[in-house]
Each structure stands twice: as structure tokens, then as C-alpha cells.
């Protein structure tokens, strides 16, 4: 599941890794963009072992899912929600 | 040190059972998915199976699945491998490994083997 | 299940050369790719993880590149003690994977 927010008062990341993530390890990922108090987009992966990674953004493994993403809601309707889940 | 020692290995004839084990010191087994694989004699590596560390996730090698079933006691810091309806084609070296969820996310170690030989 | 083309099945390198070997996967693994080597009569040793990443103590000779369904694995110097069999493995998902192995001899 992939889930977007909106609303950051400040950066959570401190320390980001470009390492690839098998999904069957992945519970959810988190995508902040940049604003509300962080100059800077983050992308907080929570694994299924209950820890917490930050990816950096430019990382190829997460680019590439990003753009697959992508591909995927451009051919669906968008949810206007505030909160985006994305299975 | 990390110390992965596989045994339970030995000679069976075909139709028969086995069970490997696999005893893991100097790492935190309870936290790790871990992995069975196996080499037959002059071949290449074949993923077997893979447990995650509740048990609760349990993937196989789709033409193994039916005979062999993956386990673990983590109070016991052991991983199984309980293999049924052998046949001479699984004959193989089987090695546990560890599944590294954390950092790498590969098989970072690696027991020495136990060899399995099928045979009438 | 994803298949791992590896290529050349063997090669012979002088020391000091540098040696290359490909990895095709049938579908796309991301950068969810590493490569093992394996010395005769021993368990196999992780070398690269994530297509690039160099695992802790691995020379700096050896390196991994790729994505998508291409990958490469390098040498750039061969030294004796690599005399061994190559491995690439694709572990995006399951069931894992491995290439049929690169045997590698000194001339």
C-alpha cells in the first residue's frame, strides 16, 4: 500500500538509504512531498518486521516504482482525498 | 560469529523421508526470514524454500512444495526442512541461509551444507 | 517463475584482467539483484546486493551494475584467489531465483 501526505510540520528523515526493497518485506510506503516545514520531498518505507527506512527520492529502485505508479494513475480516475492509498 | 551448521543429511532411498536441520548461533535467529537452498552435484543453485520469522509467510519452489515443508523452533534457534517422497533428482548439497530484512535484503549468510543422496 | 539468463557459462581471464558477466531476467526485477561467488566445495558468499551495492568486505574489484531485466557483474582486475563459480540471483520476488553460474579459470 502506498499512502501520500499532505501535511508535514518539519523533515523525518534523517539518514536515507537507495537500497532495493523486495514488496513481500514492504508493509507500506509513505510519500511526503516537499512543503509544510520540509524543504525537501521524503519517502518513509514501514517493512513488515516493524522497522522504519527512509528511501531516498532519488534512488533508481523507487524511481522506478514511482513511475509505475504513475503509469497506473494516470489511467484511473484520481481519488480527491487527502489521504491517497494506492494498492 | 554467525554460525549457521546444517545436519540430517545422509543416504535415503527413494520414496523415503528426511528431515535437515539447521542450527544458527551469534545472530538474533528469531528476527530473520530464513532459506533453504540446494546444489545437486556439478549444478547450479536452487532456491528451495523461505520462512519468515513468525512462520506466518512461508514461500516455496513451486515443483517442490508438495514434498517439502519448511519450519523453524525459534526457541531452539533451528531451522527444518522436512523433505517426503524423495526422489534421485534431490540429491543435492541443501544449505540454510539467512534472509536479511534489514540492511541488504539477500542471503548474507550461509551454513556449510549437508548432502543428501537418494538412491537405491 | 522469473528466469536468470547468466552468460558466459565459463571464462578463462589472465591475472590483472578484467572480466565481465551478464545476467538476464525474463521479467522486470527492479534493482532486486545480487551476485554470490562460490569456491569449489564451499557454501556460497554474497557479493553484491541491490544490482550495485557492495557487501561488507568485498574488494573494491568487484562491482555490479543494472536494473529493469540487465545486469552486469564485474572484475576489474582478476587476482588468483577469484577462481570460483559466479552466481547472479534475482530476489524481487518469490520464487527466488539464480542464474546457472559462471565458472571462472586462471590461464
Known amino acids: 500500500v502506498l499512502e501520500v501526505y499532505y501535511t508535514h510540520l518539519r523533515c523525518r528523515c534523517v539518514q536515507e538509504s537507495s537500497v532495493f526493497i523486495p514488496r513481500r518485506f514492504i508493509d507500506r510506503i509513505q510519500i511526503s512531498p516537499r512543503g509544510n516545514g520540509c524543504p525537501r520531498k521524503e519517502i518513509i518505507v514501514w517493512k513488515k518486521n516493524k522497522s522504519v527506512v527512509c528511501v531516498d527520492p532519488q534512488a533508481e529502485w523507487i524511481q522506478r516504482i514511482m513511475e509505475m505508479l504513475r503509469k497506473k494513475s494516470s489511467s484511473t480516475p484520481p481519488v480527491p482525498v487527502f489521504k491517497r492509498k494506492i494498492p | 560469529e554467525v554460525q549457521l551448521v546444517e545436519s540430517g543429511g545422509g543416504l535415503v532411498q527413494p520414496g523415503g523421508s528426511l528431515r535437515l536441520s539447521c542450527a544458527a548461533s551469534?545472530?538474533?535467529?528469531?528476527?530473520?526470514?530464513m532459506s533453504w537452498v540446494r546444489q545437486a552435484p556439478g549444478k547450479g543453485l536452487e532456491w528451495v524454500a523461505e520462512?519468515?520469522?513468525?512462520?506466518?509467510?512461508?514461500n516455496y519452489a513451486p515443483s517442490l512444495k508438495d514434498r517439502f515443508t519448511i519450519s523453524r523452533d525459534n526457541a531452539k534457534n533451528s531451522l527444518y526442512l522436512q523433505m517426503n517422497s524423495l526422489r534421485a533428482e534431490d540429491t543435492a548439497v541443501y544449505y540454510c541461509?539467512?534472509?536479511?530484512?534489514?540492511?541488504?535484503?539477500?542471503?548474507?549468510?550461509w551454513g556449510q551444507g549437508t548432502t543428501v543422496t537418494v538412491s537405491s | 517463475d522469473i528466469q536468470m539468463t547468466q552468460s558466459p557459462s565459463s571464462l578463462s581471464a589472465s591475472v590483472g584482467d578484467r572480466v565481465t558477466i551478464t545476467c538476464k531476467a525474463s521479467?522486470?526485477?527492479?534493482?532486486?539483484v545480487a551476485w554470490y561467488q562460490q569456491k569449489p566445495g564451499k557454501a556460497p558468499k554474497l557479493l553484491i546486493y541491490?544490482?550495485?551495492y557492495r557487501y561488507t568486505g568485498v574488494p573494491s574489484r568487484f562491482s555490479g551494475s543494472g536494473s529493469g531485466t540487465d545486469f552486469t557483474f564485474t572484475i576489474s582486475s582478476v587476482q588468483p584467489e577469484d577462481i570460483a563459480t559466479y552466481y547472479c540471483?534475482?530476489?524481487?520476488?518469490?520464487?527466488?531465483?539464480f542464474g546457472g553460474g559462471t565458472k571462472l579459470e586462471i590461464k
Open positions: 520462512i519468515n520469522p513468525e512462520s506466518s509467510t512461508i
Open positions: 551469534g545472530i538474533d535467529f528469531s528476527r530473520y526470514w
Open positions: 521479467q522486470d526485477v527492479n534493482t532486486g
Open positions: 541461509a539467512r534472509q536479511d530484512d534489514y540492511e541488504y535484503y539477500a542471503m548474507d549468510y
Open positions: 541491490s544490482a550495485s
Open positions: 540471483q534475482q530476489y524481487y520476488s518469490t520464487p527466488l531465483t
